[in-house]
């Protein structure tokens, strides 16, 4: 039975040209994490496999860095990076858990303007 839950950073925004950390955390289970995939709906960004280590897709090699931990750092963000990102935790014996993060990449001035009105 799958008892675990995935906690994610949820909806996040970042500045064009900046970087962002995509992070998920699996809790409430003792299942062993054997692989974590980071994906968009139409392509895979990276895989962290317990035996094989990290694999970064060639399409993202220049601007994706593994970590921290099982997370993923996206660099040199463009407006085209706006969209959904999925973390897929492959575990034993539970099976697969999926988390979702929505990233909005904003033009610098918009991001700065928005930041002034954020509630602490």
């Amino acid at each position: 039975m799958m008892t675990g839950t995935i906690e994610t950073t949820g909806n996040i925004s970042a500045e064009k040209g900046g970087s962002i950390i995509l992070q998920c955390h699996l809790s409430s289970t003792t299942a062993q994490v054997t692989q974590v995939n980071w994906e968009q709906q139409d392509q895979l960004l990276a895989i962290c496999n317990a035996d094989l280590g990290w694999h970064i897709s060639p399409s993202f090699k220049d601007r994706v860095a593994p970590g921290p931990g099982l997370g993923l750092t996206l660099q040199s963000l463009t407006v085209n990076d706006t969209g959904e990102y999925f973390c897929i935790y492959h575990t034993y014996p539970d099976g697969t858990y999926t988390g979702r993060i929505f990233l909005e990449v904003l033009e610098s001035s918009v991001a700065e303007h928005g930041a002034r009105f954020q509630i602490p």
Epitope: Q35, N37, E39, Q41, D42, Q43, L44, I47, N49, L52, H55, S57, P58, S59, F86, I88, H90, T96, T98
Partner: antibody
């Protein structure tokens, strides 16, 4: 449990449009996942055609991009395939399928055979 | 597009035997490969995803392995009901592509 069922004409004339419907029961197509069309040619070759995601955005196989459209009717929980300017090479069994990121195509319809012939 | 090649169109085996089906990707797809079983007159059924993970309800006689470009699907102790065509598929990047299939024949 989720079920998918394809329907539409079994015979289409060359140069016309092929239109198919996928009826989904047991799950709302606006809740999650990518809802796909896949075809299988005589001789068994499988070809992914495209999808519409729960949010409404689409992605098509570049080999079909100029001819294909996938749309949906959220009130009926249906999604549709339209393939224009068909030829005999489009004769195939057409499947609708639900894809989950990281897994693949976990749920398929039973398939519907479409023959393109005058 | 990523091309998935299954070199054997047909494989013959006997009940109780172990059989392995291979699949080669035209580029590194890490572990992003799925395997499907299609029995006569039925739609394909997902057996294995991410190269080695069994989908829900799939018997443990079905296993998958491999990474990079070379993948193997194995049936330990083949049963009569395993008569089917088996396909590999890459879920690395769209357009998602399938191998040509390997038809398993039972002697």
């Amino acid at each position: 449990d989720v079920q998918l069922q394809e329907s539409g004409p079994g015979l289409v004339k060359p140069s016309q449009s092929l239109s198919l419907t996928c009826t989904v029961t047991g799950y709302s197509i606006t809740s999650d996942y990518a809802w796909n069309w896949i075809r299988q040619f005589p001789g068994n070759k499988l070809e992914w055609m495209g999808y519409i995601v729960y949010s409404g955005s689409t992605n098509y196989n570049p080999s079909l991009k100029s001819r294909i459209s996938i749309t949906r009717d959220t009130s009926k929980n249906h999604f549709f395939l339209q393939l224009n300017s068909v030829t005999a090479e489009d004769t195939a069994t057409y499947y609708c399928a639900r894809r989950q990121v990281g897994l693949g195509f976990a749920y398929w319809g039973q398939g519907t055979l479409v023959t393109v012939s005058a | 597009d990523i091309v998935m090649t299954q070199s054997h169109k047909f494989m013959s085996t006997s009940v109780g035997d172990r059989v392995s089906i291979t699949c080669k990707a035209s580029q590194d797809v890490s572990t992003a490969v799925a395997w499907y079983q299609q029995k006569p007159g039925q739609s394909p059924k997902l057996l294995i995803y991410s190269a080695s993970y069994r989908y829900t309800g799939v018997p443990d006689r079905f296993t998958g392995s491999g990474s990079g470009t070379d993948f193997t699907f194995t049936i330990n102790s083949v049963q009569a009901e395993d008569l089917a065509v088996y396909y590999c598929q890459q879920h690395y990047s769209s357009p998602w592509t399938f191998g040509g299939g390997t038809k398993l024949e039972i002697k």
